[in-house]
Interface confidence: medium
Amino acid sequence: QLLEPCGYIYPEFPVVQRGSNFTAICVLKEACLQHYYVNASYIVWKTNHAAVPREQVTVINRTTSSVTFTDVVLPSVQLTCNILSFGQIEQNVYGVTMLSGFPPDKPTNLTCIVNEGKNMLCQWDPGRETYLETNYTLKSEWATEKFPDCQSKHGTSCMVSYMPTYYVNIEVWVEAENALGKVSSESINFDPVDKVKPTPPYNLSVTNSEELSSILKLSWVSSGLGGLLDLKSDIQYRTKDASTWIQVPLEDTMSPRTSFTVQDLKPFTEYVFRIRSIKDSGKGYWSDWSEEASGTTYEDRPSRPPSFWYKTNPSHGQEYRSVRLIWKALPLSEANGKILDYEVILTQSKSVSQTYTVTGTELTVNLTNDRYVASLAARNKVGKSAAAVLTIPSPHVTAAYSVVNLKAFPKDNLLWVEWTPPPKPVSKYILEWCVLSENAPCVEDWQQEDATVNRTHLRGRLLESKCYQITVTPVFATGPGGSESLKAYLKQAAPARGPTVRTKKVGKNEAVLAWDQIPVDDQNGFIRNYSISYRTSVGKEMVVHVDSSHTEYTLSSLSSDTLYMVRMAAYTDEGGKDGPEFTFTTPKFAQGEIE
């Protein structure tokens, strides 16, 4: 049989509000007192196996002892009542678990949602943590009928067990209860139809229009409780490579619909669309977004002509010259479709013209030494661009008017070029550039800028520590103006090698040093200056600085009959590099001098 305990602790299931005081009592049975020769003064209270200080304990009478705890904060404490039997052996009488926490707060922010095809889900904010087992019950009723309670598993939401009935108002509230109290939220009263979150629209399709290259037509299927609800839509779109969505104005999609035409789009551009829906009154919740669907607008004729330029090769026996017409492929945003070919028309006079259809981006033609007009248009399947027109003057005409104050400078990892326009109205500017090298020809790239531009950056893939020769040519209605050129670096570095110094002439007390300019491929920047370091085997090193325009320098005040070691360094804006060391010996006597 089970042994009877020697006494009891009251209360047997203590739950205390945190921060408050709490008193427990231990009552010993009479039989226990006699058996163990003890009374209440022999009681030892313990919390989590640690003795409670005597000052918290009060002996009420020979059978009863109390213990008081102030400002209880621990969530759970094992409280035991023990006796010292026969005055020395500690024996457990009884134990309880003391819990602490808070009564439930009044639940707030109660909201309900009816996900289409599912039961109603309500959510709330339970307030502060109670640290106690707390039951939350979602209650709901009509004016005349109660619905089954919904016992929350999580304490913050509950899905009811019954299907919602639309177009009848329902009252909903939450009750929260634990050992320290019971409280109800404010109730909310609503028609479940106003809390619907529709399933996303589906079968979204996108079609283009041959008539209009700026539109795409969307169609989709909406659910809306199987047609019970009228839904309005929210349509967003972006270009295929963009990350941000463009919003179709909501006022354009307010009426219930299953199709829409999106306007003001760019031709021959792939767009991605998504759509969501909500009850047309705006009550309830937006559906999740539909699966994305994409479509491409129809082609339109190219919106502008290509950049157009020419290069003249040496003339053939002075009778005619070979001219290479060059142009740039249009970017997609201006091509408005797949460029099929280019139409080039060359006119010598009103009566003599020749038309070429070219698939590439250059055409070489032979022209006499007369003035010609070349026009260029790009063609896609819809039509041709406007024509770019270039006047190719006679080679006997001297180009007048150039840009002035031409400058180039690196900024933000780009190479910028700026200039002051010539005094005569310009049609456009041509910028040409290439890497200067002694090992390879200067392979030119080029770009065209509008007449209004006088500052731009080079749009090719430029390399660091390479010297670029940049040429700017204004183009007038009558033909190209004069060209202005300069050199520039995207980013300078220290030279790849220093100068190799040699002696040009050596005297008793002076020496003329000479060196060659560092090849442009090794300069890595603008050579700003040189330093010449020279010393004897025992003497102090001397350094002189020489301007970069020099290729020789005279060392003076040298000692006769002495070995000198010389080294030169070249400096760009980014640092210097030493050349090889060179030695020479001054003669003992000057020329014509004898011992």
Epitope: V352, Q354, N366, T368
Partner: nanobody
């Protein structure tokens, strides 16, 4: 490579007719003019007629205007010279030529880069 092959030459009585043909092949670069030239022994080669392959405009030397007609077929790889009312002074070696120069001087021989071997035309009394 570019080749021009003339045919149709021969001997004919004064006042008679001949039709010369010239087939051009291997031309990757579009020609602008096709021309007929003739050379009499001891004299410089002179322009007779030329046709623009782009617009079909025709130019004739004053000495053959109204008697000779230059034409091309639809595929533009053959050019013809129809010669009527032939005179003794029309005798000579007739050459077909192709030019890539855009010009109004279409019977200037210096502007033609490609030449055929020639076909002999002899007019007798």
């Amino acid at each position: 490579q570019v080749q021009l092959q003339e045919s149709g030459g021969g001997s004919v009585q004064a006042g008679g007719s001949l039709r010369l043909s010239c087939v051009i092949s291997g031309f990757t670069y579009r020609q602008t003019f096709m021309g007929w030239f003739r050379q009499v022994v001891g004299k410089e080669r002179e322009g007779v007629a030329a046709i623009s392959t782009g617009g079909g405009s025709m130019v004739y030397a004053d000495s053959v205007k109204g008697r000779f007609t230059i034409s091309q077929d639809s595929s533009k790889d053959t050019v013809y010279l129809e010669m009527n009312g032939l005179k003794l002074e029309d005798t000579g070696m007739y050459y077909c030529a192709a030019s890539t120069v855009i010009t109004s001087e279409s019977i200037n021989r210096n502007l033609y880069q490609y030449w055929g071997q020639g076909t002999q035309v002899t007019v007798s009394s």
